[in-house]
Amino acid sequence: MKRFLFLLLTISLLVMVQIQTGLSGQNDTSQTSSPS
């Protein structure tokens, strides 16, 4: 049961992060031209 809840929580967090990234309209990539 605990494992299931942990899995559910992890998936929820991943979905939330994905939604926020998608709605931000930004390329959340890091700089590749210099070592920022």
């Epitope: 930004q26 031209s33 210099s34 070592p35 920022s36």
Partner: antibody, heavy 114, light 111 residues
């Protein structure tokens, strides 16, 4: 879509001052070192000023040709970078790009002439 | 400062033929994190520069695979397998390992 919009260029007399501004969008601005790159027929493309991240205490670096005359700054809350230029010379004439090198805008033209 | 020397300064080509541009650095561009910050830009006539290649050989999004970057340390090359009309312009190498410096540019023009 990534956008970089430079503004503030124009005609200024030798010895005068000018401040360039740049607004960025479409990428995580506060993760990128930002630069002002000048393009002129004489010197081609040259990076004249660089500003790093908050985690680097906004460290700056300048080309010898502008050291002591130009100051770069940034405002991460506005995704903006600025270039304060004092004691301008004829050789400062050119197109000024605000760029992380990864992405480029259209630039703003500065002409220093009497 | 790191000096980048590009050759040739002008390259006259025929559409459909290959092209190659060299960029040599005065110092190694290998950074302490193991990455080499060597980029290639294209500036088409009347336009601002656009990056094509980063980290020596990685193509930016939307860049055709006829472009290829290679090299290490101080010697780098940009190759176009078959030149197309849209490839004409000035190519610049630019390093980001120690404060950005640019090559003088190579003008790719029609023969």
């Amino acid at each position: 879509e990534v956008k970089l919009e430079e503004s503030g260029g124009g005609l200024v007399q030798p010895g005068g001052s000018m401040k360039l501004s740049c607004v960025a969008s479409g990428f995580t601005f506060n993760k990128y070192w930002m630069n002002w790159v000048r393009q002129s027929p004489d010197k081609g493309l040259e990076c004249i000023a660089q500003i790093r991240l908050k985690s680097d205490n906004y460290a700056t670096h300048y080309a010898e040709s502008v050291k002591g005359r130009f100051t770069i700054s940034r405002d991460d809350s506005k995704s903006s970078v600025y270039l304060q230029m004092n004691n301008l010379r004829a050789e400062d004439t050119g197109i000024y790009y605000c760029t992380p090198i990864d992405y480029w805008g259209q630039g703003t033209t500065l002409t220093v002439s009497s | 400062d790191i000096v980048l020397t590009q050759t040739p300064r002008t390259l006259s080509v025929t559409i459909g033929q290959p092209a190659s541009i060299s960029c040599k650095s005065s110092q190694s561009l290998l950074y302490s994190n193991g990455k080499t910050y060597l980029n290639w830009l294209l500036q088409r006539p009347g336009q601002s520069p656009k990056r094509l290649i980063y980290l020596v050989s990685k193509l930016d999004s939307g860049v055709p695979d006829r472009f290829a970057g290679s090299g290490s340390g101080t010697d780098f090359t940009l190759k176009i397998s078959r030149v197309e009309a849209e490839d004409l312009g000035i190519y610049y190498c630019v390093q980001g390992t120690r404060f950005h410096t640019f090559g003088a540019g190579t003008k790719l023009e029609l023969k």
